[in-house]
Interface confidence: medium
């Protein structure tokens, strides 16, 4: 029988009455327009909702917005528009919520054309009160908080000025003109690019990269001939124009731009791009676009210095600069990433890696599924996941894949089972082991969310018709109960739950439509009475992550260590609770050659784990530029994979080669950099 229909599934007793007592409706006294929702702080229960409505008049558009606040996870809302003087808020800037639990909020107002500057409303008490501040400039971007100090804000103006505030937007100072892009780094450092001649667009490839570590008192030029820059983990990347032609190369710094090394990545031409797919303090995934309008490129993974790169995946789907890629970090299990490749026949296939890009493989076919029409062999096929690209192509896919760090092993995604992604209506699949095995969870497209660290999964069918039913599961998607949350169906627009998946509240957003009006409405359902008791020790079971062969004592070893987790038993209906902390037990593994990548000048022949010297580099000076200085590179041919914790076992020490090299690119070398003070 289908999941949810057998006898096993009658576990949650009297749930209708329990949920009915915990379902809270709020009708917003609003014409429909658009709505945006932001959570303020963590575990505070504070939600801000901004509704906006545009009335097109003959010569202009008249806008009206309303601001609502909840402090009980969305059960009740209060209209607080008067706190912002009934001002129209610009939705393209959204609500700028401060980092961590700072309680800070910045709203950017719409101002009339002739005004000297913009206007913001600031709150530092979780939106209980707001202060109106007139700006000495018109903002081009949303206010950006320093990750280290929420009183420090930066913004770009419509005239390309870089403005900084040190007192949470009360007073602003323009610290530099002609700025294209600005980003906060660590320790309240600001990195930004500037143009000298006409504009950001005209000077692309001739920009300068600057740094200030004291909020604009002094500056240092840390790069020239810059096309763009990015920050990822502890790495600072710059895409730099080559001296001789129109190609560009990536340079990397791990000391905030004081010294640079050329990344051992292919150079790209005018129509190509680089993209940092993911980065942490250990390593980076970098996409390098193929020449021509192919829609694909190559993923490379870095060493711990961000300099030496190993080819990870060919024909990686990534449409155009700023376009669509399906690259997804599965946050519920270490080392797991999912993405799509474009096959020779132009079909799209899903690939998964369990070891941080070391090896990629197809997703295993779900046990309870048949291969679809895309499969040549009806008995052999794979699961293919719909992500950003499918959504951009307007396929019937309402949501991207979902995983949460505290819902260990759980991944939920739309997919199809065959030789490639299908354009047919997808179903929803779940993995409870981080992507190793999959099960069909729900028929047809759904919205879904995870509550109580995986203790509850909630889903709503994706339909063009009004809906009034929500589905929920307390056993990781095996069995489903349905609950009618309102007599009058609503046009559904979205599910909202507090980020972090610790909450037991879910808000269903939509609108009602009658002959005369349409209004926003939300239903917030609290599942606390479904999970009546707190989980105890007996409710958890030991689970070894990445286990594929329980026989092997190295079973579960990924990046040099294995982890045993305490996981909630599927049969246990209880609350993990808001304070739930994932319990894991790591064990170090013995090293094998798989724990090492090949250093610069070395490669792995196919089906061999040993690193051998690249024949074309034997006896040659290597085109390798370390910190922009002439120096010898010594290597033993192997380098531990970033983040790998293995000990003992294989220790691939070999004779240390003295690899001479010439610096072909020295425009980021220290002697070319300069400093100045304001």
């Amino acid at each position: 029988s289908a999941p949810g229909e057998d006898e096993e599934c009658g576990r949650v007793r009297d749930f209708v009455a329990k949920l009915a007592n915990n379902t809270h409706q709020h009708v917003f006294d609003d014409l429909r327009g658009s709505v945006s929702l932001s959570w303020v702080g963590d575990s505070t229960g504070v939600i801000l909702v901004l509704t906006t409505f545009h009335v097109p008049l003959v010569i202009m558009t008249f806008g009206q917005s309303k601001l609502y606040r909840s402090e009980d996870y969305g059960k009740n809302f209060k209209d607080i528009t008067d706190l912002i003087n009934n001002t129209f808020i610009r939705t393209e800037f959204g609500m700028a919520i401060g980092p961590e639990n700072s309680g800070k909020v910045v709203l950017t107002a719409e101002v009339s054309g002739g005004s000297r500057g913009g206007r913001i409303f600031r709150s530092s008490d979780f939106a209980k009160n707001f202060v109106q501040t007139d700006l000495p400039f018109h903002p081009l971007t949303q206010m950006m908080y320093s990750p280290q100090n929420s009183d420090y804000l930066l913004a770009l103006s419509t005239e390309n000025g870089l403005w900084v505030s040190k007192n949470f937007g009360g007073k602003w100072e323009e610290i530099h003109k002609a700025v294209c892009l600005a980003k906060w780094g660590s320790d309240n450092t600001i990195f930004f690019t500037t143009y000298a001649n006409g504009s950001c667009k005209a000077d692309l490839g001739a920009l300068e990269l600057w740094r200030t570590s004291d909020l604009g008192k002094s500056f240092k030029t840390i790069g020239v001939k810059i096309y763009s820059f990015g920050l990822g983990g502890r790495f600072l990347f710059a895409s730099v124009m080559a001296d001789k032609d129109t190609t560009r190369r990536i340079h990397v710094s791990t000391d905030q731009g004081d010294t640079w090394s050329m990344a051992q990545l292919p150079s790209v031409g005018q129509e190509q791009f680089y993209s940092i797919l993911a980065a942490n303090d250990d390593m980076v995934f970098m996409h390098v676009d193929e020449p021509g309008d192919t829609g694909f490129g190559t993923i490379f993974t870095s060493d711990d210095r961000g300099i030496v790169y190993s080819k990870s995946l060919d024909r990686h789907l990534y449409t155009t600069t700023g376009g669509e890629t399906d690259f997804t970090n599965v946050t519920s299990l270490r080392g797991v990433y999912i993405t799509s490749v474009l096959s020779e026949d132009n079909s799209i296939q899903t690939m998964i890696t369990f070891d941080q890009g070391g090896r990629w493989t197809h997703l295993r076919k779900p046990e309870n599924s048949e291969c679809d029409a895309t499969a040549k062999n009806k008995n052999e096929c794979s699961l293919h996941i719909h992500a950003s690209y499918s959504i951009s192509q307007k396929l019937n896919v309402p949501m991207a894949p979902l995983s949460e760090p505290n819902a260990v092993g759980i991944v939920i995604a739309h997919g199809s089972v065959g030789d490639a992604i299908s354009v047919m209506v997808p179903d929803v699949y779940i993995s409870d082991d981080g992507g190793y095995s999959w099960t069909k969870m729900l028929e047809g497209p759904h919205y879904y969310t995870i509550l109580d660290s995986g203790g509850i999964i909630v889903a709503i069918e994706h339909s063009s018709r009004p809906i009034n039913v929500i589905k929920f599961s307390t056993d990781e998607g095996q069995c489903w109960q349905t609950y009618t949350f309102t007599r009058d169906p609503i046009y559904f627009t979205g599910l909202a739950s507090e980020p972090g998946a610790r909450s037991m509240n879910i808000s269903i957003w939509g609108f009602t439509e009658s002959f005369l009006t349409s209004q926003w409405v939300s239903y917030t359902i609290d599942f606390k009475d479904i999970l009546e008791r707190n989980c105890e020790e007996k409710d958890y079971t030991i689970w070894l992550a990445h286990s594929t062969d329980p026989e092997d004592y190295e079973d579960g070893c990924i990046l040099g260590y294995k982890e045993q987790f305490l996981r909630l038993r599927k049969s246990s209906v209880c609350q993990n609770g808001r304070d739930y902390v994932v319990t894991k037990q790591p064990s170090i593994c013995l090293c094998s050659l798989e724990d090492f990548l090949c250093d610069f000048g070395y490669y792995r022949p196919e089906n061999d784990s040993k690193c051998v010297e690249q024949p074309e580099l034997k006896g040659h000076d290597l085109e390798f530029c370390l910190y922009g200085r002439e120096e010898h590179l010594t290597t033993n041919g192997y380098r531990k994979i970033p983040g790998d914790k293995c000990q003992g076992g294989v220790n691939p020490v070999r004779e240390v080669k003295d690899l001479k090299k010439k610096c072909t690119s020295n425009f980021l070398s220290p002697e070319k950099q300069n400093s100045k003070s304001n």
Epitope: P550, E551, D552, S587, I588, C589, L590
Partner: antibody, heavy 118, light 107 residues
Framework: EVQLVESGGDLVKPGGSLKLSCAAP????????MSWVRQTPDKRLEWVAI????????YYSDTVKGRFTISRDNAKNTLNLQMSSLKSEDTAMYFC???????????WGTGTTVTVSS | DILMTQFPSSMSVSLGDTVSITCHAS??????IGWLQQKPGKSFKGLIY???NLKDGVPSRFSGSGSGTDFSLTISSLESEDFADYYC?????????FGGGTKLEKR
């Protein structure tokens, strides 16, 4: 009740061989990894070898590698340790121990004595 | 190999005392440590695994703490059947290694 009973300990000359066995009634033997651990006369403990539940994987301490072989017969619920090229420093009480899913020294046998002396 | 250094090698204690035995690992082992008890002339009994987890059937007066390199076993309100030898063992990596043992003797 889970119990492990070792046998086969004896007095043997240096360079000689000996086979120890461990009978494991009272639990599903084939689902557990098993270890041999020895206790020297001065009461120091030394891990000797481990074998996975199905017998596919074995690991040894460097001091016995190449001389000792751990094996199991899941049909008979028996763990074995074949010892050859014995040295005087192999003199010890030998214990078999069960590996549970959490850790490697869950249940212990009563031990059997091996003496290597000329 | 990871060296497990156990202190003290022996101690004289009285009934009702609270006793702490420590083990230092020569390198980080997370909490991959167990504690064993051996009574005179007898075999071994597992007391604690993963540093802090009490094995089923072991009295709650036994507790373990620590992670990384420094660990301890504490017995609160010592009872007569607790006079025995105690060993720590690391199972973070092969070869598994044991501490030198601590003998609890009657004062």
């Amino acid at each position: 009740e889970v119990q492990l009973v070792e046998s086969g300990g004896d007095l043997v000359k240096p360079g000689g061989s000996l086979k120890l066995s461990c009978a494991a009634p009272g639990f599903t033997f084939s689902t557990y990894g098993m270890s041999w651990v020895r206790q020297t006369p001065d009461k120091r403990l030394e891990w000797v070898a481990i074998i996975s539940s199905g017998g596919s994987y074995t690991y040894y301490s460097d001091t016995v590698k190449g001389r000792f072989t751990i094996s199991r017969d899941n049909a008979k619920n028996t763990l074995n340790l074949q010892m050859s090229s014995l040295k005087s420093e192999d003199t010890a009480m030998y214990f078999c121990s069960r590996s549970s899913s959490h850790w490697y020294f869950d249940v212990w046998g009563t031990g059997t004595t091996v003496t290597v002396s000329s | 190999d990871i060296l497990m250094t156990q202190f003290p090698s022996s101690m004289s204690v009285s009934l009702g005392d609270t006793v702490s035995i420590t083990c230092h690992a020569s390198q980080g082992i997370s909490s991959n440590i167990g504690w064993l008890q051996q009574k005179p002339g007898k075999s071994f009994k597992g007391l604690i695994y993963h540093g802090t987890n009490l094995k089923d059937g072991v009295p709650s007066r036994f507790s373990g703490s620590g992670s990384g390199t420094d660990f301890s076993l504490t017995i609160s309100s010592l009872e007569s059947e607790d006079f025995a030898d105690y060993y720590c063992v690391q199972y973070a990596q092969f070869p598994y290694t044991f501490g030198g043992g601590t003998k609890l003797e009657k004062r």
